[in-house]
Interface confidence: low
Amino acid sequence: KKVVLGKKGDTVELTCTASQKKSIQFHWKNSNQIKILGNQGSFLTKGPSKLNDRADSRRSLWDQGNFPLIIKNLKIEDSDTYICEVEDQKEEVQLLVFGLTANSDTHLLQGQSLTLTLESPPGSSPSVQCRSPRGKNIQGGKTLSVSQLELQDSGTWTCTVLQNQKKVEFKIDIVVLAFQKASSIVYKKEGEQVEFSFPLAFTVEKLTGSGELWWQAERASSSKSWITFDLKNKEVSVKRVTQDPKLQMGKKLPLHLTLPQALPQYAGSGNLTLALEAKTGKLHQEVNLVVMRATQLQKNLTCEVWGPTSPKLMLSLKLENKEAKVSKREKAVWVLNPEAGMWQCLLSDSGQVLLESNIKVLPTWSTPVQP
């Protein structure tokens, strides 16, 4: 007997062919011998089966000797043996309908688990293999689980169900809710305006929730909440903001924060959390601020940085177009009795300049100028 696999909710077409290429009498029945459909002359007739409103045939193929049974919006319980009776012969087709669904929702937070559950007819013993968008294969029986979802798991998961050497393919679109970047770092000179951006790695029609930015300044003993906000249908409204610093927030996505001035006391690390409506758990993005200051006090030219810098970063002081006078893997460098000219303070990583501040040293009889 021929085996056909179908997908829950889909349409299947079971074929039945006569040797004569003309419209002749046929019937389709189920295993209980209940008539599903057939013909009476050139008209389609339907029997009392449960499939009544979902069963059809391709009337226009009858005169080619083809008498298909089409079952729309397949259900697991449609799994059965279907018998086509035509020209005093019987053709049997076993239909097995499978369904594959994601545990709760197809929109999951980064770090959460995805469980795929296979619905299958009694007596079947299918195997399932799923391939994630990043090419990772997982195998299982009735359930498959993937823990710790990552951003790269967003996209179409392709799952193949195998039964009786036949296969049926399911595609499930999974959206991993996360920020585009887990962490970002902003380098600024003292006094400059700071822009923090928190782009999301997904798009949904309606996005509602609430968020908060906690800040741990390098100089402070504890962290504090800088701003709290609400998100309603992608519109941002500020609920509460500290007086110092007085952050400003954009009204539209992506989430965007502006710090009017980069000051040493603000240098440090922040954690933006976003709790989405109807989701357990929160999205997180870390943001870091590094602030540089170059100063000349009497005969001492100093360059300092505050904030989370890695030990491999190099801080240098150099006279323009000359070799570095001082270069250290430290957060402060200085030069005593600097000669007159334009001095550059550079924070660099493997030769790549991350931050630069210029200070003009005048001959000793005048005061320094900071451009």
Partner: antibody
Amino acid sequence: EVQLLESGGGLVQPGGSLRLSCAASGFTFSSYWMHWVRQAPGKGLEWVAVISYDGSKEYYADSVKGRFTISRDNSKNTLYLQMNSLRAEDTAVYYCASDYGDYGTYDYWGQGTLVTVSS
Amino acid sequence: DIQMTQSPSSLSASVGDRVTITCQASQDISNYLNWYQQKPGKAPKLLIYKASNLQSGVPSRFSGSGSGTDFTLTISSLQPEDFATYYCQQSYNFPATFGQGTRLEIK
């Protein structure tokens, strides 16, 4: 959104060959019977060929039988029409169309691709 | 093959008019009759399937009726966007065949 996008049309000499493609998106391509329908300049619509959802059955209009071959690649969501021994009377805009219900009800159509057979 | 004959072959009407186009099949086709609308340079669009069923997204001013050999497409109140060519098509017997079309023009 359902989209059918034909390509491969152009100018060809009588007796020449051409292969048309129709890229489908926005629906379960592998559940639909797919057709080619053509329209000669300033004329009506003429059905050309049909292929079953799984590619197991093909039917052709008498005017193209033996010269045209319809095929599909469900893994690429693409329908094809290989046209050989082309004649001047094959000059037309060729449309691909999907058919989910009873055979011959074209619920979605592509924008068409023009095939001109001329020396 | 089943022959499909539409009438009239062209028709002039004004916005707001009620318009009827008929289609006759050369043999009984039950209710396996579809109607399409085609605008210049565009692909046809399915309006009505199986004689009287309105395709999703099609305005309710379009309606279809008939069974056997005689069928009608009615537009209850013509809108500017309805000026186009209309085709009937049978899907009862192989091969599917179309009527020659009815061109609906602005009066």
